[in-house]
Interface confidence: medium
């Protein structure tokens, strides 16, 4: 009869390497007399027998993993024991070895040139991949503007044109490779002006030819304004090439004129656009600019800049000795004395102001101011400045002048041209088109004048829903 | 008699700084635009910056914007530009000069003797 | 970018007239670039003659006056005097996307 005998391991356990889906044996061969009962555990947590995950044969001696999983990781050991002595135990690891695997793969990427670009690109794997990127077919490069991320992801800092194209990351290990698909970087270009429309000075009758190139991505489109408004007249001839657009306006030339070209773009939800001007001026004109009673000028001030057309010609009173001197001055004083009116009166009464005292112009023989379109001004003295308004007439009959309005340079509204009349007569106040769009609720208004004062309009669906009702589309 | 004395000239380093300042007098200093012109050696004259009566806005020649800034201190009746980031094709004489009215760009009507700014390793 | 072009050099006799012109490298000069004229003698700091297009700087003689030629801004001076000998720069005040005043390279007058 055979003497008990206290279990020995005699093959003990070893680090086991096993790539995810395929399987992983442990062997933990035991000597002992009785047979010994041999557990194992994973990380110190007993495995049941029962776990289908797990296959224990040769009487507990061979542990088998039947799929591995990355989780599977860990501290295997067997523990042997008979009753003889005291029980033995043999522990190795299991190191879970994975091929490279995208697990964010880069997507499709549109953005606007000088900003910052991220490509995703998050890995797994063991051991850790180590990532790269393909532009096109050529490996890509890192330098001062373009890295790859300790996350795999590719940074490029002030994307350029050229950095627009197909990429890929490619994910690699000692046990493979991985690529992700093909995506694109897209490289938007604001809309910029190469080449800006040239002035000219030519005889009455002319023809001529204004040619505006723009680029950008995408190619913009190029529109022409007069004056401030859409070109009435001329006819416009546009080609695009290499993502340059190339617009020529030809024009029968019989007044002078301010031209801007204007190209625009758009980039998701926003829009970029570039300006060019050039004045088309009539060569027996020059000498008369400055007649007795004004000239048409840029505004070169600072009060109004935020206001009036950027392009604008406007009138200039020679009546003053420095007529842009007088006129800032007396809209600086204006302004300064706005700050006490009400948040809604405000901009009204600034873009009433400044294109009262700084009128749009036309360069003809005798230079000639284009006042403010009664409804504009009626729209501002008896809608968005209404209590302000009464608080200057009461103040005025009473002879107070202390604050608020009255200091400020204010047209007489039932003096100026109706636009209903002649469109063409009179100045819009943009500001007022754009706020009456935004305002539901107005204040009572009790007009200081008689209603016979007050142009009655022909209902619009953009009139003002006061009464009286000014239609100003 | 309108005078414009300019002074804090000198020799810097690239990438250095300096403040001119230009004390103004014999005018209504608060009442008038003011600019900084600069001349380098031999060449001509380059508008470099430009500020209203009020000191409410401030232009600048392109290729400073972003290292110079022009400033005024009506109470003290002084104008002032600091120019951060030096290069060498900054090194000129700066003149201080007076606008002939309340706006940044009306002519240039008076003028300091200058001060010469040398930038140079 | 703005270019304001001049002539590099002029003479002109004593007693003589001469034109300076003031171009656009793109376009034409208007009123609405208030062309202004400088005189400046070498060592001295400039001086001003003609402001927006044609008007006489206070202490100016009338011997200059400013106009405005074809698509250029122009410095006439009649009945040359050798102390006229300068160099002569004009200022244009120009809009493109931002404000800004823009020097030409100057005109070397030689009173011969």
């Known amino acids: 009869e055979k003497l008990p005998k206290a279990p020995v391991i005699t093959t003990p356990l070893e680090t086991v390497d096993a790539l995810v889906e395929e399987v992983a044996t442990f062997m933990c061969a035991v000597e002992s007399y009785p047979q010994p009962e041999i557990s194992w555990t994973r990380n110190k947590i007993l495995i049941k027998l029962f776990d289908t995950r797990y296959s224990i044969r040769e009487n507990g001696q061979l542990l088998t993993i039947l799929s591995v999983e990355d989780s599977d990781d860990g501290i295997y050991c067997c523990i042997a024991n008979n009753g003889v002595g005291g029980a033995v135990e043999s522990c190795g690891a299991l190191q879970v070895k994975m091929k490279p695997k995208i697990t964010r793969p880069p997507i499709n990427v549109k953005i606007i040139e000088g900003l910052k670009a991220v490509l995703p690109c998050t890995t797994m794997g063991n051991p850790k991949p180590s990532v790269s990127w393909i532009k096109g077919d050529n490996a890509l490069r890192e330098n001062s503007r373009i890295a790859v991320l300790e996350s795999g992801s590719l940074r490029i800092h002030n994307v350029q044109k050229e950095d627009a194209g197909q990429y890929r990351c490619v994910a690699k290990n000692s046990l493979g490779t991985a690529y992700s698909k093909l995506v694109k970087l897209e490289v938007e270009v604001f809309a910029r002006i190469l080449r800006a429309p040239e002035s000219h000075n030519v005889t009455f009758g002319s023809f001529v030819t204004l040619r505006c190139t723009a680029i950008g991505i995408p190619v913009p489109t190029i529109s022409w304004i007069e004056n401030g408004n859409a070109v009435s007249s001329g006819s416009i001839q546009e080609s695009v090439k290499d993502r340059v657009i190339d617009s020529r306006l030809q024009l029968f030339i019989t007044k002078p004129g301010l031209y801007t070209c204007i190209a625009t773009n758009k980039h998701g939800e926003k829009f970029s656009t570039a300006k060019a001007a050039a004045t088309v001026s009539i060569a027996e004109w020059s000498k008369s600019q400055k007649d007795s009673q004004g000239y048409c000028a840029q505004y070169r001030g600072e009060v109004c800049d935020a206001v009036l057309a950027k392009d604008a010609l406007v009138f200039f009173n020679t009546s003053y000795r420095d007529p842009e001197d007088a006129q800032e001055l007396l809209i600086h004083t204006a302004w300064n004395e706005l700050k006490a009116v009400s948040p809604l009166c405000r901009p009204a009464a600034e873009a009433l102001l400044c294109n009262h005292l700084f009128q749009e112009c036309s360069p003809g023989v005798v230079p000639t101011p284009m006042p403010i379109c009664r409804e504009y001004c009626l729209a501002v003295k008896e809608l968005f400045c209404a209590k302000e308004w009464q608080a200057m007439e009461g103040k005025a009959h009473r002879g107070l002048y202390r604050s608020g309005m009255h200091l400020l340079p204010v047209p007489e509204c039932s003096k100026l041209p109706s636009m209903h009349r002649d469109p063409t007569a009179c100045t819009r106040l943009p500001y007022l088109d754009y706020k009456k769009e935004n305002i539901t609720t107005f204040p009572s208004i009790t007009s200081s004048r008689p209603s016979a004062d007050i142009p009655n309009l022909p209902a619009s669906t953009s009139s003002f829903a006061v009464s009286p009702a000014y239609s100003m589309t | 008699e309108v005078q414009l004395l300019e002074s804090g000239g000198g020799l810097v380093q690239p990438g250095g700084s300096l403040r001119l300042s230009c004390a103004a007098s014999g005018f209504t200093f608060s009442d008038y635009g003011m600019s900084w012109v600069r001349q380098a050696p031999g060449k001509g004259l380059e508008w470099v910056s430009a500020?209203?009566?009020?000191?409410?806005?401030?232009y600048y020649k392109e290729s400073v914007k972003g290292r110079f800034t022009i400033s005024r201190d009506n109470s003290k009746n002084t104008l002032y530009l600091q120019m951060n980031s030096l290069r060498a094709e900054d090194t000129a004489v700066y003149y201080c000069?007076?606008?002939?009215?309340?706006?940044?760009?009306?002519?240039?009507?008076?003028w300091g003797q200058g001060t010469l700014v040398t930038v140079s390793s | 970018q703005t270019v304001v072009t001049q002539e590099p050099s002029f003479s002109v006799s004593p007693g003589g007239t001469v034109t300076l012109t003031c171009g656009l490298s793109?376009?034409?000069?208007?009123?609405?670039?208030?062309p202004d004229w400088y005189q400046q003698t070498p060592g001295q700091a400039p001086r001003t003659l003609i402001y927006?297009?044609?008007s006489r700087h206070s202490g100016v003689p009338d011997r200059f006056s400013g106009s405005i030629l074809g698509n250029k801004a122009a410095l006439t001076i009649t009945g040359a005097q050798a102390d006229d000998e300068s160099d002569y720069y004009c200022?244009?005040?120009?809009?493109?996307?931002?404000?800004?005043?823009?020097f030409g390279g100057g005109t070397k007058l030689t009173v011969l």
């Open positions: 927006s297009t044609d």
């Open positions: 200022g244009l005040y120009s809009y493109s996307g931002s404000k800004n005043y823009v």
């Open positions: 793109s376009g034409s000069v208007t009123s609405s670039n208030y």
């Open positions: 500020i209203p009566w009020s000191g409410g806005s401030t």
């Open positions: 000069a007076k606008r002939s009215g309340r706006i940044a760009f009306g002519a240039l009507d008076a």
